[in-house]
């Protein structure tokens, strides 16, 4: 068992200036890297997984594109990308790394996601072995990063496959580490050079400061000046800072991403894998031909690196490279109450009692093909029917007789007759009235609008009913 | 069960539009892409383009100055207009929903033969 | 555009026997994304396969897909009266899709 860390250590244009992005971002951003682990040397395609696992950074300060005058570098997250494996480090692997861009704008569905850079290294490495730098192109990005595998304890050796225990009964004790190199024997870490920089240096033997790539002076404190040497491929030197050519072309193979070197009078020629060209293999634009976008979608245009690829996403994702999923069901697209399923392939929606169709939207109880029975008319609305049935007639269809003197509608004690025009209330003596609500004065004027002409108190009031609703 | 009806003239003259239209019932058409496939008369089948609700379209470039695919959310249709044509735009028309995994086709109208001849 | 190369051009077999289509990619299709269809004479294409290998909803388990990169392979496990037909592969990785040229099983 193991860590396998990733140092970012700066991402922006490469020397041949600014590049020309597919994205154009229309707020703040922010950086994030995923790293993928990959054993064996060979092409895997593009989707098969990160057999060795793979990790996601923290984001990174946010920043403001400004597209006149691109930023010479990002802003990045802090910390290194760790990803732990469990099993044998296989010692050839192949590392992706790809840079992420968010945008923070007010898109729907949250915040976009596109992929800038995606950059491939096919290498050796042992584990417990020093950091590794290195300096990739993709397109016209330029990625600086080391890396390095270590063992976890007690596992050690190069592909962290052999367990050592002290050789003493006791455990070892605090600050220290169990078996030296060669001996089952505790031992202490090394301590580094004082003031060695705990961010771009470290040490594998007590005292010194060695520094990972992009950072010089005896504490690791210095930036490296970008400005003579980094296209130069070759071992490292902490002294400079810079990278120095070996005394053959081929010398610490200057061919990157798993090119082979070839030796030709007074130079080199790399043979690069597919997807990688340039002079030494260090150019790997994304395009179509890799495959971004995820989730089915087809990508479009893109046919070379430096034209811009889109993709165009099934409805059920969003973002550049279709990695986002959409809640479809957040759109509410069922209608009249149904319940929303997202099926991933397909919308599903299960409708409530009485609606039908795809997206519930057929009111099984409407008026179409529905008569309201002796001459009550159908009313839509509210997701149901109902009819306004004619005086006399009730029930959800106006089948049912209805007593309009059912509800007991003449006042102070007068008496109710059900009439073929409506219902007729005789007033009890005192009350007028078509509900017999108006009580009648002793000189015989009505305290409230007067009575009809020729109506005596207590004769039969006639109110027509005109209709009666029935609620379903 | 949802179902595409393509509509539209079977007999076309040269240099002229062929216009075609494809219903689609028992499903709304803001839920997915939308294409149209032709196959000439003992051939394979050659894709044409498609569109989504929101206005996206893609074509396929051997056809693209001549064509243009529409769609009409009132009435659940869309369709398709090429013009300038030949006698090399005979073909069976299909129309056809993408599926929502991915570019593929999983649902196709019956076809309708469009010649073009004077 | 990425080309589509079928094989055989016509398979000829008998009800029961086991079917084996080819469909060769001019260049690697990405995330597997490859589809299978059947046509029968006077009918529209019906989608069998999506995704190189996963079956379209009710098609029997006898239809199976398979490859990556360039190579895929459709295989019909036992021939029913009814496979017999057109089949195409179509790729929708990169635009413009295209389609394979077909391969007819046909009755021996």
């Known amino acids: 068992a193991g860590v396998f860390e990733l140092q970012i250590h700066s991402f922006g244009p490469g020397p041949g200036g600014a590049p020309r992005s597919p994205y154009s971002a229309r707020g703040p951003c922010r950086l994030f890297f995923r790293v993928c682990l990959k054993p064996g040397l060979s092409e895997e395609a593009a989707e098969s997984p990160c057999a060795l696992g793979a990790a996601l950074s923290a984001r990174g300060p946010v920043y403001t594109e400004q597209p006149e005058a691109p930023a010479p570098d990002l802003p990045l997250p802090n910390g290194l990308l760790q990803v732990p494996f469990r099993d044998a480090w296989p010692g050839t692997f192949s590392l992706i790394i790809e840079t992420w861009r968010e945008e923070l704008g007010d898109q729907i569905g949250g915040p976009a996601w596109s992929l800038l850079a995606r950059v491939t290294r096919r290498r050796r490495l042992a584990a417990g072995g020093p950091w590794a730098g290195d300096i990739q192109r993709a397109g016209a990005w330029e990625l600086r990063f080391s890396y390095r595998a270590r063992c976890e304890l007690p596992a050690v050796g190069t592909a962290c496959t052999r367990l050592c225990r002290p050789r003493s009964a006791s455990r070892c004790g605090p600050g220290l580490r169990p078996c030296a190199p060669l001996e089952d024997e505790c031992e202490a870490p090394p301590v580094c050079r004082a003031g060695c920089s705990l961010e771009h240096g470290f040490c594998e033997q007590p005292g010194e400061c060695r520094c990972l790539e992009g950072w010089t002076g005896p504490l690791c404190m210095v930036p490296v000046s970008t400005s003579s040497c980094l296209g130069l491929r070759g071992p490292s030197s902490t002294t400079t800072g810079c990278l120095v050519p070996g005394p053959g072309p081929c010398d610490g193979n200057p061919c990157a991403n798993g090119g082979s070197c070839s030796e030709t009078p007074g130079s080199f020629e790399c043979t690069c894998p597919r997807g990688f060209y340039g002079l030494r293999c260090e150019v790997s634009g994304v395009t179509c031909a890799d495959g971004p976008c995820f989730n089915g979608g087809l990508c479009v245009g893109g046919a070379d690196p430096d034209s811009a690829y889109i993709c165009h996403c099934p409805p059920g994702f969003q973002g550049s490279n279709c990695e986002k999923r959409v809640d479809r069901c957040s759109l509410q697209p069922c209608r009249n109450g149904g319940l929303c399923l997202d099926l991933g392939h397909a919308l599903r929606c299960r409708c409530r009692a009485g609606f039908a169709g795809p997206r519930c939207e057929h009111d099984l109880n409407d008026c179409a093909g529905r008569a309201c029975a002796n001459g009550g008319t159908c009313v839509e609305g509210g997701g149901a029917h109902r009819c306004s049935c004619a005086l006399g007639f009730g029930g959800r269809d106006c089948r049912e007789r209805a007593d309009p003197c059912a509800a007991r509608p003449c006042a102070h004690g007068g008496r109710c007759y059900a009439h073929f025009s409506g219902l007729v209330c005789a007033c009890a003596p005192g009350y007028m009235g078509a509900r017999c609500e108006f009580p009648v004065h002793p000189d015989g004027v009505s305290a409230l609008p007067a009575a009809p002409p020729g109506l005596r108190p207590g004769d039969p009031q006639r109110y027509p009913h005109h209709h009666h609703h029935h609620h379903h | 069960q949802v179902q595409l009806q393509e509509s539209g003239p079977g007999l076309v003259k040269p240099s002229e539009t062929l216009s075609l239209t494809c219903t689609v019932s028992d499903d709304s058409i803001s839920n997915y892409y939308w294409s149209w496939i032709r196959q000439p008369p003992g051939k394979g089948l050659e894709w044409i383009g498609y569109?989504?609700?929101?206005?996206?379209?893609n074509h396929n470039p051997s056809l693209k100055s001549r064509l243009t695919i529409s769609l009409d959310k009132a009435k659940n249709q869309f369709s398709l207009r090429l013009s300038s044509v030949t006698a090399a735009d005979t073909a069976v028309y299909y129309c056809?929903?993408?599926?929502?995994?991915?570019?593929?086709?999983?649902?196709w109208g019956q076809g309708t033969m469009v010649t073009v001849s004077s | 555009e990425i080309v589509l190369t079928q094989s055989p051009g016509t398979l000829s077999l008998s009800p029961g026997e086991r079917a084996t289509l080819s469909c060769r990619a001019s260049q690697r299709i990405s995330r597997t994304y490859l589809a299978w269809y059947q046509q029968k004479p006077g009918q529209a294409p019906r989608l069998l396969i999506y995704g190189a290998s996963s079956r379209a909803t009710g098609i029997p388990d006898r239809f199976t897909g398979s490859g990556s990169g360039t190579d895929f392979t459709l295989t019909i496990s036992r021939l029913e009266p009814e496979d017999f037909a057109v089949y195409y592969c179509?790729?929708?990785?990169?635009?413009?899709?295209?389609f394979g040229g077909g391969t007819k099983v046909e009755i021996n």
């Open positions: 179509q790729q929708y990785g990169t635009s413009p899709l295209t």
């Open positions: 056809a929903r993408v599926f929502n995994w991915g570019f593929a086709f999983d649902i």
């Open positions: 569109i989504f609700y929101s206005g996206t379209t």
